[in-house]
């Protein structure tokens, strides 16, 4: 097999500190076009399990603004436009990576963090527990 | 407005390099327990707009495994368990941050990248275009 040599342009890291800290370039390569979920689609309004988008802002985190979905109803919207409580609106969650300033207020020192965010809602058949 | 003073314990960074590259601590703080969406909920099966989860794998990215939702039907499942084509199953998308090695083969130098992933599906009323 071929051993890929370490790139000579790599930042140096001593074994005693490695791999606690790495260098991350913040010039983000973005393969997408639009980051605002309200602009990118109106599914949140047209869904049978509609949701509101709440702005979650934290200046000590990157990205500082994350949009969180909150389902509008416990039930789902039926064909008549009414809430049907025989069905449930539930949030779809996704685990995402964020950077948190550490120590706080340091402009160029961060810690990786995983957080769970609600992206939107879907309509599901409820799990019914029958009592004997 | 109040200017938060810079923490005196911050690593040093010259303005000419900031904020291109930052230092990131890899002791990841994980506020969640399980990263596997199949285990965390069965909404993908119980939804009126059910979806399948496909593994998107790239060993040169972190996270290397990302689950992508693909809606099973064009329409939505009605109360009889049949597909109703008067409604549409659509993917809910989320922009997430991932890390990629840069320069390649450097063990501790990375670049942030944004990718768009489909997290699940929701059932929406279609937009009907009437032709005059």
């Amino acid at each position: 097999g071929i051993t890929i040599p370490r790139n000579p342009g790599c930042p140096n890291s001593e074994d005693k500190n490695f791999p606690r800290t790495v260098m991350v370039n913040l010039n983000i390569h973005n393969r997408n076009t639009n980051t605002n979920p309200k602009r990118s689609s109106d599914y949140y309004n047209r869904s049978t399990s509609p949701w509101n988008l709440h702005r979650n802002e934290d200046p000590e985190r990157y990205p500082s603004v994350i949009w969180e979905a909150k389902c509008r109803h416990l039930g789902c919207i039926n064909a008549d436009g009414n809430v049907d409580y025989h069905m449930n609106s539930v949030p779809i969650q996704q685990e995402i990576l964020v950077l948190r300033r550490e120590p706080p207020h340091c402009p160029n020192s961060f810690r990786l963090e995983k957080i769970l965010v609600s992206v939107g809602c879907t309509c599901v058949t409820p799990i019914v527990h029958h009592v004997a | 407005g109040i200017t938060i003073p810079r923490n005196p314990g911050c690593p040093n960074s010259e303005d000419k390099n900031f904020p291109r590259t930052v230092m990131v601590n890899l002791n990841i703080h994980n506020r969640n327990t399980n990263t596997n969406p199949k285990r965390s909920s069965d909404y993908y099966n119980r939804s009126t707009s059910p979806w399948n989860l496909h593994r998107n794998e790239d060993p040169e990215r972190y996270p290397s495994v990302i689950w992508e939702a693909k809606c099973r039907h064009l329409g939505c499942i009605n109360a009889d368990g049949n597909v109703d084509y008067h409604m549409n199953s659509v993917p809910i998308q989320q922009e997430i941050l991932v890390l990629r090695r840069e320069p390649p083969h450097c063990p501790n130098s990375f670049r942030l990248e944004k990718i768009l992933v489909s997290v699940g599906c929701t059932c929406v009323t279609p937009i009907v275009h009437h032709v005059a």
């Epitope: 791999p19 790495v22 | 060993p59 990215r61 290397s64």
Partner: nanobody
């Protein structure tokens, strides 16, 4: 889903040998560095050994060099750890873990297998 399952842990006397195995599924095993990690009673996690995708590079923590050998069989999606000349301080739960590009960082590891070394 990504799954890792260790086996082979047992009680053994000092100086004895054991062979740990790990079966992997839910990812392309041959595309990742793989690790053995251990946690001694009351201690933190410590990486023990790691092996490159094709098995051509292997690294060990100083305390096990010359005694432990890591290997893999990509055709069987399996990882192994041959442990010789075992010492009391090797007593721990041993986990296999899937490597990531983040150095020594793991998102997935198994349930673990207990190795007890005592007389």
């Amino acid at each position: 889903q990504v799954q890792l399952q260790e086996s082979g842990g047992d009680w053994v006397q000092p100086g004895g040998s054991l062979r740990l195995s790990c079966g992997a599924s839910g990812f392309t095993f041959s595309s990742y560095w793989m690790y053995w990690v251990r946690q001694a009673p009351g201690k933190g996690l410590e990486w023990v050994a790691k092996i490159k995708q094709d098995g051509t590079e292997k690294y060990y923590v100083d305390s096990v060099k010359g005694r432990f050998t890591i290997s893999r069989d990509n055709a069987k999606n399996s990882l192994y750890l041959q442990m010789n000349s075992l010492r009391a301080e090797d007593t721990a739960v041993y986990y296999c873990a899937k490597g990531e590009i983040l150095p020594h960082y793991f998102d997935y590891w198994g349930q673990g297998t207990l190795v007890t070394v005592s007389s």
